[in-house]
């Protein structure tokens, strides 16, 4: 089973999407060009993220298309900012025992959430599902990101960084077992979704991880086939 965490080393090159999930639905965190942050039921170019891990479990999350950092204000509101403020734009990442990831501000202690309520993170707590995230590899064709290629100066035309300025073409993968109590491969949610209705294949599937099991902070949230 792929690793629950999107943090595959100190600077993982691949694009990922963070999404919340219940038994029936899921929302992908997206950072819009105007800095607004919300959730979408499917992968979008604005939900494609790069997550850089730093020391002591801190992470920096960036929206690739908006070119904005995910940040949080003192009230717990999340927003995208072009300016990186270490106090507001770094989050503590923690993987819960159910295999889901939570992100909270070390400065203000609020959880990153797609719900509207602002809740402080407390060790051992069982956050609501819209504050717990899983990660999924990007499935949107890179052409949709329309990233301008920088002008070449002295570098060779074969230079990888020239052809792939965002370093997204060759994401590294790491396979580790999910918690034993949680590991359960689930059917793809595309089973009942014909390609005709999703030609880009951006709505479901390609999950980096799936978990199932009991409820509560010690167990795993019910995780049926969501759409």
């Amino acid at each position: 089973y792929p690793n629950a965490s999107p943090l595959l080393g100190s600077s993982w090159g691949g694009l990922i999407h963070l999404y919340t999930a219940t038994a029936r639905n899921s929302y992908h965190l997206q950072i819009h060009k105007n800095g607004h942050v919300d959730g979408a039921p499917h992968q979008t170019i604005y939900s494609a993220l790069m997550i850089r891990s730093e020391d002591a479990g801190f992470v920096v999350i960036t929206g690739v298309m908006s070119r904005r950092y995910l940040c949080m204000d003192f009230r717990g509101n999340i927003f995208g900012s072009h300016y990186f403020d270490p106090e507001n734009c770094r989050f503590q990442h923690q993987t819960l025992e159910n295999g889901y990831d939570v992100y909270h501000s070390p400065q203000y202690h609020f959880l990153v959430s797609l719900g509207r309520a602002k809740r402080a993170f407390l060790p051992g707590m069982n956050p609501p599902p819209y504050s717990q995230f899983l990660s999924r590899r990007n499935e949107i064709p890179l052409i949709h990101f329309n990233t301008p290629i920088p002008r070449r100066h002295t570098r060779s035309a074969e230079d990888d960084s020239e052809r792939d300025p965002l370093n997204v073409l060759k994401p590294r993968a790491r396979m580790t077992p999910a918690p034993a109590s949680c590991s359960q491969e689930l059917p793809s949610a595309e089973d009942n979704s014909p390609m005709a209705s999703d030609p880009l294949g951006v709505v479901r599937g390609g999950r980096v991880n799936t978990h199932a099991g009991g409820t509560g902070p010690e167990g795993c949230r019910p995780f049926a086939k969501f759409i």
């Epitope: 039921p41 069982n126 609501p128």
Partner: antibody
Framework: QVQLVQSGAEVKKPGASVKVSCKAS????????MHWVRQAPGQGLEWMGI????????SNAQKFQGRVTMTRDTSTSTVYMELSSLRSEDTAVYYC??????????WGQGTMVTVSS | AIQLTQSPSSLSASVGDRVTITCRAS??????LVWYQQKPGKAPKLLIY???SLESGVPSRFSGSGSGTDFTLTISSLQPEDFATYYC????????FGPGTKVDIK
């Protein structure tokens, strides 16, 4: 402002099917799941199912498996709920409701479906 | 599936009364609980989300509390327009509703 406008009341015979529509406006249609909830006369609210607005994928409550079909038309920002093999117990008001991640924040006005021979 | 129970199923109260309605989940649902108000012939109206957050435009006399399995909706001073049926709903693993509590005039 967000609005969900449903189709008018229907009277159907047992065994027939009914198709109720819900037209959304005032927001980006593909950014929110849509739900269907029904309420029999004098009874409580009963969740029926959910549709993903961009893929058309659906997930229904066990009770309605095989009898309910939810579809959507993104060009008109409309979702549809068709219930087949109607019986008298299906007499109810049917609501569409928008998913706001942490609640159903906007509801249609409801469509009364009466099943009677 | 997680089941929700509400108590009481109905209650009679007077204008100005403090009213408390409880909702209990069969398993822990964190704070993923919602309260709605419904009046006859109308669609439900969102009051409280995430167990305790007041929806925009809802009077402050409404409040919610609880986490895990036990939740409460409180109306601090009942007003004439508050006579209605109140439903809880969980957003944790499914979207089922409680059976409702009818608040009528004493």
């Amino acid at each position: 402002q967000v609005q969900l406008v449903q189709s008018g009341a229907e009277v159907k015979k047992p065994g027939a099917s009914v198709k109720v529509s819900c037209k959304a406006s005032g927001y980006t249609f593909t950014n929110h799941y849509m739900h269907w909830v029904r309420q029999a006369p004098g009874q409580g609210l009963e969740w029926m199912g959910i549709i993903n607005p961009i893929s058309g994928s659906t997930s229904n409550a066990q009770k309605f498996q095989g009898r309910v079909t939810m579809t959507r038309d993104t060009s008109t920002s409309t979702v549809y709920m068709e219930l087949s093999s109607l019986r008298s117990e299906d007499t109810a008001v049917y609501y569409c409701a928008r998913d706001a991640v942490d609640a159903f924040d906007f509801w249609g006005q409801g469509t009364m479906v009466t099943v009677s021979s | 599936a997680i089941q929700l129970t509400q108590s009481p199923s109905s209650l009679s109260a007077s204008v100005g009364d403090r009213v408390t309605i409880t909702c209990r989940a069969s398993q822990g649902i964190s704070s993923a609980l919602v309260w709605y108000q419904q009046k006859p012939g109308k669609a439900p109206k969102l009051l409280i989300y995430d167990a305790s957050s007041l929806e925009s435009g809802v009077p402050s006399r409404f409040s919610g509390s609880g986490s895990g399995t036990d939740f409460t909706l409180t109306i601090s001073s009942l007003q004439p327009e508050d006579f209605a049926t109140y439903y809880c709903q969980q957003m944790y693993d499914d979207f089922n509703f409680g059976p409702g509590t009818k608040v009528d005039i004493k």
